[in-house]
């Protein structure tokens, strides 16, 4: 396990190669999630922010940027879409939840949550999975699209088994996360693939 | 195996410090964090705070932050727990435990130090 | 700080027995609970890890279920080298915390 604290992997260039594996040996599937990082972008294309795809399963769970202003989040290939006003180009804590049991989903923006919305009420999201920053993975582990690459920085990344309530939410953007159990930024096991540099986190 | 071996029991005087080491072999101690736990006589355990090897980066319980140093030695794959302004309830064993690869659980422990703090 | 409440903090029970021990939480905790097994003058050794979870090597007849505030261990059939004491540790929260243990003795 590396400890990231204070540090980004930067990924300095559009590509259709350069990205991270981060690997978790997580043995059960998901009812209940909440994700959170920081990212550093100048894009204003779209691009994938987290990739967590299954065997035989495109867009399982994914964090996609379709333009400023508008974060969706994938669950078993469904899609919903949240818009909130920022500033651009910006750094950005993102945090994004989802509870199978309401099919709620609800993405947080710089600590304020943006309008819940619903999606795949009672499915639960497939385990063993193949988790990609940097691209966008069209199947298990590969098949990546240099429109849909992430150019820019990611840190801080955490992920728990479980919708974290307001007050976590807001300990994580405000740099004092919990312990997670899915992954943590403190204890990460991660490939570099390609042409991806950690460099100090400089812009919180 | 993997393995951590700690230093030997110590006797100290309230108000001064004590420094307790553990030794890890049979992995990469660069790779994973070091807990340090304390047991009084007869109680339960009690988590101090953590430390990773690599980064330097701590944790430590409020209870103990003001009073408890971790520290590692890279070159020895040695860690180490400074607790000052002992008083008699600091009186314990205190063991280093390995974070387990799975999550924030500790799957190795050393055998324990007794720390005796008497007049 | 979560506090961990262990019961009973002792029982006394014969080889072959089923026994349970329970861990009750102060808060929400999720499933992020290990518990481990001390004898006299050792240091603990983990046996479950998030609430159910055995660990490698450990035996089938210790099992752990339970999740948000209330977690068991179950032994289904007590052996003479399992008489020892029990902790119920939460990693869901620093700083991180331990029941007050549960102490098995042989009845």
């Known amino acids: 396990h590396t400890d990231l604290s204070g540090k980004v992997f930067v990924f300095p260039r559009e590509s259709v190669t350069d990205h991270v594996n981060l690997i978790t040996p997580l043995e059960k599937p998901l009812q209940n999630f909440t994700l959170c990082f920081r990212a550093y972008s100048d894009l204003s294309r779209a691009y994938s922010l987290f990739s967590y795809n299954t065997q035989g399963r495109d867009n399982e769970l994914l964090v996609y940027k379709e333009r400023v202003g508008e974060y969706s989040l994938y669950i078993g290939r469904h899609k919903v879409t949240s818009k909130v006003i920022e500033k651009f180009p910006a750094p950005v804590h993102i945090c994004v939840s989802w509870e199978s049991s309401s099919g709620i989903a609800e993405f947080w923006i710089n600590g304020t949550p943006l309008v819940k919305k619903g999606l795949r009420q009672g499915y639960f999201v497939e385990a063993q999975p193949k988790i990609v920053l940097g691209q966008e993975q069209d199947s298990y582990g590969g098949k990546f699209d240099r429109s849909q690459s992430f150019v820019g920085e990611i840190g801080d990344l955490y992920m728990w088994d479980s919708v974290l309530p307001p007050e976590n939410i807001l300990s994580a953007y405000q740099g004092t996360p919990l312990p997670a159990n899915i992954l943590d930024w403190q204890a990460l096991n991660y490939e570099i693939r390609g042409y991806v540099i950690i460099k100090p986190l400089v812009w919180v | 195996q993997v393995q951590l071996v700690q230093s030997g029991a110590e006797v100290k005087k309230p108000g001064s410090s004590v420094k307790v080491s553990c030794k890890a072999s049979?992995?990469?101690?660069?790779?994973?964090?070091m807990h340090w736990v304390r047991q009084a006589p007869g109680q339960g355990l009690e988590w101090i705070g953590m430390?990773?090897?690599?980064?330097?980066?701590?944790n430590y319980n409020e209870k103990f932050k003001s009073r408890a140093t971790l520290t590692v030695d890279k070159s020895t794959s040695t860690a180490y727990m400074e607790l000052s302004s002992l008083r008699s309830e600091d009186t314990a064993v205190y063991y280093c435990?390995?974070?387990?690869?799975?999550?924030?659980?500790?799957?190795?422990w050393g055998q324990g130090t007794l720390v005796t703090v008497s007049s | 700080d979560i506090q961990m409440t262990q019961s009973p903090s002792s029982l006394s029970a014969s080889v072959g027995d089923r026994v349970t021990i329970t861990c009750k939480a102060s808060?929400?905790?999720?499933?992020?609970v290990a518990w481990y097994q001390q004898k006299p003058g050792k240091a603990p050794k983990l046996l479950i890890y998030?609430?159910?979870y055995r660990y490698s090597g450990v035996p089938s007849r210790f099992s752990g279920s339970g999740s948000g505030t209330d977690f068991t261990l179950t032994i289904s059939s007590l052996q003479p080298e399992d008489f020892a004491t029990y902790y119920c540790?939460?990693?869901?929260?620093?700083?991180?915390?331990f029941g007050q243990g549960t102490k098995l003795e042989i009845k």
């Open positions: 435990a390995r974070r387990n690869d799975y999550y924030w659980y500790f799957d190795v």
């Open positions: 049979g992995y990469t101690f660069t790779s994973y964090w």
């Open positions: 430390i990773h090897p690599n980064s330097v980066n701590t």
């Open positions: 808060q929400n905790v999720n499933s992020n």
């Open positions: 998030s609430a159910s």
């Open positions: 540790q939460q990693a869901n929260n620093y700083p991180f915390t």
